[in-house]
Amino acid sequence: KAMHVAQPAVVLASSRGIASFVCEYASPGKATEVRVTVLRQADSQVTEVCAATYMMGNELTFLDDSICTGTSSGNQVNLTIQGLRAMDTGLYICKVELMYPPPYYLGIGNGTQIYVIDPEPCPDSD
C-alpha cells in the first residue's frame, strides 16, 4: 500500500559538510513502528546511506558508525547527514515504511537535492 512522503526539493550543506532536512509522511493508519531509510541517487545508481527503525515515543537511533542522525515528532522525521563532501552532492531520497501494526505501508519521497561545496583552503600566510 502506497503512502505519500514529502521532503524539500533542495538543501545546501553547511561549510562543515552537514545537511538537514525534514521527511514527512502521511500515515494512513496508526503507525507505531516506522523504518526510515535514506537513499542516494547519483548517475542512475541508488545506494543506501543509512536506515533506522523506531517505535513511536522512542528515540530514532541509527547504527553507531552511521553518518546520519535524526529525531522524530509525530509523522515527521528530522534527518541530519554529516561528513559530506562535494563528491557527495546528489539526490537524497527518503523512504518510509510503516512496519507495525499491519498493514504494511511504503512511501518514497521525490528526493532532496543536496549540494555540497568543499570549503576553500585557507590561503598561506607568510
Partner: antibody, heavy 120, light 112 residues
Framework: QVQLVQSGAEVVKPGASVKISCKAS????????INWVKQNPGQGLEWIGD????????NSNQKFEGRATLTVDTSISTAYMELSRLRSDDTAVYYC?????????????WGQGTLVTVSS | DIVMTQSPLSLPVTPGEPASISCRSS???????????LYWYLQKPGQSPQLLIY???NLASGVPDRFSSSGSGTDFTLKISRVEAEDVGVYYC?????????FGGGTKLEIK
Amino acid sequence: QVQLVQSGAEVVKPGASVKISCKASGYKFTDHFINWVKQNPGQGLEWIGDINPNNGGTNSNQKFEGRATLTVDTSISTAYMELSRLRSDDTAVYYCARLRREYFYAMDYWGQGTLVTVSS
Amino acid sequence: DIVMTQSPLSLPVTPGEPASISCRSSKSLLHSNGITYLYWYLQKPGQSPQLLIYQMSNLASGVPDRFSSSGSGTDFTLKISRVEAEDVGVYYCAQNLELPLTFGGGTKLEIK
C-alpha cells in the same frame, strides 16, 4: 534470559473486572510491543490487542474494544490488561507475549498464562 | 477479519514418520513487498505457545530443521520430516497481514 511472568489465577463474579499483570525481564522493556491473547478452555487463540510500552499507544481487536484496557508501568517493566464487565464466556487463559521485529512482529516469548474463571 | 482454517483437526503419527498440516487463509497473505505474513506456533501440552516459523518459511531460533513450511498466498503446509515424541501438541497457523491478528483453530498432533 527473556522472561514474561504473569500474575496468578483469578476467580471473579460476572459484571466485575479483573486486572492481570505481565512482568518482563531479560531485555529492554521499551524495545518491544506486548500483545495479549485469549485462549478459551480447550480451544484456539484469539488476539486481544497490543501496547507500545514507550507511549502507551494501543491497537485492539474490536471484539474486546471498550472492555479490555491495556496499560504499562515502565518503571517496573510490567504490562497490564484489565477486562471489565466480565461474562461467563470470558472464562479463559490469558497470555501476554512479546513481539520481535527480527521475526517480522511474531510473538517470540510468551508468559505462562493466567486463568480467569468467571463464576457466580 | 481474515479467517484461518486448518486441517486436519487431529493428526495421529507414528514416530519417525512424516507429518503434514494444512492452513488456508480467506485472503492472500502475500504482500506486494514480497513478504508472506504467515506464522506457525506450537503449544505443547500444559505449556504456552511457542513460535516455530515466521514469514511463511523461516525457522525461529532453536527450532529443529525437521520442520519446514511452504505455500502460496492462501494455502500453506507445515511439514515435519520425521516426527519425534517431543513434537506432540497443538499447531496453530496465524496471520499478521492485517489487524486483528487471527489464528487457525489448531491441529492436534499425537503419537500413535
